[in-house]
Interface confidence: low
């Protein structure tokens, strides 16, 4: 199953205390897929897409970017024949960076 696309969604964080919004989108018409967001290989959040949408937006509260480190990836799962779950490939990584403080 092809990998989803992943991108940061405005408003972008300006510090580690700001929330992060990450959109994850399946490439085709996959209704109601289950999406998983990873950071540094660990599960951060799980969301299910509405049945008429092919993507979700993960909303991470401020401070959740601190640990574990590393880039974010997402993945989705869909039901195949006989209700067997099948997982997509992992998305490309997305890195969250913050402006360097001037003080």
């Amino acid at each position: 199953i092809p990998a989803p696309s992943i991108r940061l969604v405005p408003p972008y964080p300006s510090s580690q205390e700001d929330p992060i919004h990450i959109a994850c989108m399946a490439p085709g018409n996959f209704p109601g897929a289950n999406f998983t967001l990873y950071r540094g290989g660990q599960v951060v959040q799980l969301l299910q897409a509405p049945t008429d949408q092919r993507g979700v937006t993960f909303n991470l509260s401020g401070g959740s970017s601190k640990a574990p480190g590393g880039p974010f990836h997402c993945q989705y799962g869909v039901l195949g024949e006989l209700n067997q779950s099948q997982l997509s490939d992992l998305s490309e990584p997305v890195n969250v960076s913050f402006p360097v403080p001037t003080w």
Epitope: G28, P31, G32, G80, E81
Partner: antibody, heavy 124, light 107 residues
């Protein structure tokens, strides 16, 4: 061989209801998503609705949402389209069509077998 | 919704000639595009799915190409039975949408 046969079309007054059916044979109906697509006289094709193979997922075109209901009876190999609050612009040949993937994994929307259609005319 | 635009509306050709039909999407549909053939009084028939894959039983003279927003259906050498209306359809997102059709008729 794969066969899809629609029935139930006819002339109906605006505001009234009609249910069209699609009887299938030649494949395992309960393994396939199914669609309704319509074609106004002399016009192009318009997708109407889809239902997943086991019935948990349905989706509709905005033009029919809230008025039409897709359903299926896997024990009878039959797909249905209940059409309520019919309008003149619903006048069309209604086709049922099979979705090529047997499940969710390939996405929706490859319509590989179609019935011959049933004509629904909404007129006073 | 994604709007599919086909051109030309009518293509007048002779048997044996090459037919090139175009389909354009209002936004990218990746390769999630199908082509159907419809003859008068008949149901549509799937020809090509996912831009370039021939459906079961479709002759090799039919081929599809393209990705993103621009797609082409080519009939390398028209046979008498190929004169019909051809529709493109995207499945990248709901609702599924069809182009307005290209009629291939005999010159």
């Amino acid at each position: 061989q794969v066969q899809l046969v629609e029935s139930g079309g006819g002339v109906v007054q605006p505001g009234r209801s009609l249910r069209v059916s699609c009887a299938v044979s030649g494949f395992t109906f309960s393994s396939y998503g199914m669609h309704w697509v319509r074609q106004a006289p002399g016009g192009g094709l318009e997708w109407v609705a889809v239902m997943s193979y086991e019935g948990s997922f349905r989706h509709y075109a905005d033009s029919v949402k809230g008025r039409f209901t897709i359903s299926r009876d896997n024990s009878k190999n039959t797909l249905f389209l209940q059409m309520d609050s019919l309008r003149a612009e619903d006048t069309a040949v209604y086709y049922c069509a099979r979705d090529r993937p047997a499940g969710y994994t390939s996405g929706w929307g490859i319509l590989d077998y179609w019935g011959q259609g049933t004509l629904v005319t909404v007129s006073s | 919704e994604i709007v599919m635009t086909q051109s030309p509306a009518t293509l007048s050709l002779s048997p044996g000639e090459r037919a090139t039909l175009s389909c354009r999407a209002s936004q990218s549909v990746s390769s999630y595009l199908a082509w159907y053939q419809q003859k008068p009084g008949q149901a549509p028939r799937l020809l090509i799915y996912d831009a370039s894959n021939r459906a079961t039983g479709i002759p090799a003279r039919f081929s599809g190409s393209g990705s993103g927003t621009d797609f082409t259906l080519t009939i390398s050498s028209l046979e008498p039975e190929d004169f019909a209306v051809y529709y493109c359809q995207q499945r990248s997102n709901w609702p599924l949408t069809f182009g307005g059709g290209t009629k291939v008729d005999i010159k």
